[in-house]
Interface confidence: medium
Amino acid sequence: SQVSQNCHNGSYEISVLMMGNSAFAEPLKNLEDAVNEGLEIVRGRLQNAGLNVTVNATFMYSDGLIHNSGDCRSSTCEGLDLLRKISNAQRMGCVLIGPSCTYSTFQMYLDTELSYPMISAGSFGLSCDYKETLTRLMSPARKLMYFLVNFWKTNDLPFKTYSWSTSYVYKNGTETEDCFWYLNALEASVSYFSHELGFKVVLRQDKEFQDILMDHNRKSNVIIMCGGPEFLYKLKGDRAVAEDIVIILVDLFNDQYFEDNVTAPDYMKNVLVLTLSPGNSLLNSSFSRNLSPTKRDFALAYLNGILLFGHMLKIFLENGENITTPKFAHAFRNLTFEGYDGPVTLDDWGDVDSTMVLLYTSVDTKKYKVLLTYDTHVNKTYPVDMSPTFTWKNSKLPNDITGRGPQ
């Protein structure tokens, strides 16, 4: 139902949902710190522009009695309960930050008259695509899917001379929230990825995955999975792998590959890692001292959500426009704003664009090296290492189907 907004007369409030069920198991205190750091920057920027207004955040906590799984499984009702709480207290701000779970975001979007913008650090699933007042500040599944199709089709690079049209997808149901929705998108029969591939099979058991590694009758040489190197090792161990197997390991929110003195373990030699271009911005930040590389991205998304609101507030106030209007609610897209870590670009549907990086393990140096980058904003691949020292024959990626000639 319609809730009055605390969003006028020079006082602008941000409603931050602090849900027990979250895309990443992050202490709420860290997210509070991220929000507060963002508020300090926003206040300064507004003051700096000669706009003497007040900006605050209200943290809305659920009681945690009913919805306490800690992951996203019971988030649907928790999100609606929090919205009810906001409605009863008449405490809605100009913008809603959170939730991060796809289930809760989807349901909240359906069940509310969204005359206010909603900013999410997460909501990775395809069901949250193309929502007119939803902005997502962590790479959603659609962006991953577009990269994979683009990469599969590529056949004009020195290290990739075959188009691919097949894949196995390993999905055993224990994935983290981001991985769950990334793999869910690849599995969905109606998705762009499925539509563009001629063959795709989901492997759900560890043994299925392990058997494929040396199966002479396999239908594809390419296996997509999601997680970190340790996750792969638990599954693969030191098992022998056929020489033309390529494992694509999706591990977007993990900076560890770029840290100094990181050596790639031997079991990563058949693996291409897809991750995001790294950031070092939060290492010295007051709220990030105890964050792992993955959690840094999550906290940063909360901080950037505050900065995005500040950016839009500044524009509307400078133009003398009302904040509590559909125009404001629909404005959080197709723009670039100054995030904490540098410029942040949102596409036409309010989803963050980024530079994805595909890494390989150099057989010479045992280091992770950048093979190519991909700009999600323009859906374009940029080769970086034209002469990679691959484990694969002739330092080229193999065909996706054994024995098939050049495409």
């Epitope: 920057i41 522009a49 000669g50 911005s281 930040s285 100054e338």
Partner: antibody
């Protein structure tokens, strides 16, 4: 208390490359843009460009093809290189810090380095 | 690029008098404007940002006003240490740009 200390060659010949470094002491290095601004003798201030801890750069199109700005976060330093200098590049060069993150006005300045280009 | 124009180029004022300096932008900068003071041999010093907000430690005799394209810096009662060159600067867009300066000298 934040302090900016800058250094570099003061006398150059035409066509050489100007090279200046600015070190930041005290305060946070991340969370700010760090700028280079110059002032020819007896004239006004000209903004050259800026960089943040991540290496994101904004620079002045009038100098863009000759300017390189870089950052070394491990040393809390940033640097300016200006190639193919001429007498018109003779100026006092200042490094400066914004008042806050991405604010565009400058509350901390280096001491300035006079760079003279002469054959 | 936004061009900033200051007037007058030189302003002669007696100590204790009021000084009024003008700055005009070639297009709107809303209130994204700063004023600096510079003395010979020194780096500029930030006086005003946001068109009218005094920076930390700046005396109350300095005040800024204006928005859009027309701005004014007023020095209420000139002290001996106020004789210097004053610059305006816009930070609405890149590249940042400064005015050519107004020299406030003793009359």
């Amino acid at each position: 208390q934040v302090q900016l200390q800058q250094w570099g060659a003061g006398l150059l010949k035409p066509s050489e490359t100007l090279s200046l470094t600015c070190a930041v002491f005290g305060g946070s290095f991340s969370g700010y843009y760090w700028s280079w601004i110059r002032q020819p003798p007896g004239k006004g201030l000209e903004w050259i460009g800026e960089i943040n801890h991540r290496g994101n750069i904004n620079d002045n199109p009038s100098l863009k093809s000759r300017v390189t700005i870089s950052v070394d976060t491990s040393k809390n330093q940033f640097a300016l290189k200006l190639s193919s200098v001429t007498a018109a590049d003779t100026a006092v060069y200042y490094c400066a810090r914004e008042r806050g993150y991405s604010f565009g006005n400058y509350d901390h300045w280096g001491q300035g380095t006079l760079v003279t280009v002469s054959s | 690029e936004i061009v900033m124009t200051q007037s007058p180029a030189t302003l002669s004022v007696s100590p204790g008098e009021r000084a009024t300096l003008s700055c005009r932008a070639s297009q709107t900068v809303t209130r994204n404007l700063a004023w600096y003071q510079q003395k010979p041999g020194q780096a500029p010093r930030l006086l005003i940002y946001g068109a009218s907000t005094r920076a930390t430690g700046i005396p109350a005799r300095f005040s800024g006003s204006g928005s859009g394209t027309e701005f004014t810096l007023t020095i209420g009662s000139l002290q001996s240490e106020d004789f210097a060159v004053y610059y305006c600067q816009q930070y609405k867009s890149w590249p940042r740009s400064f005015g050519q300066g107004t020299n406030v000298e003793i009359k």
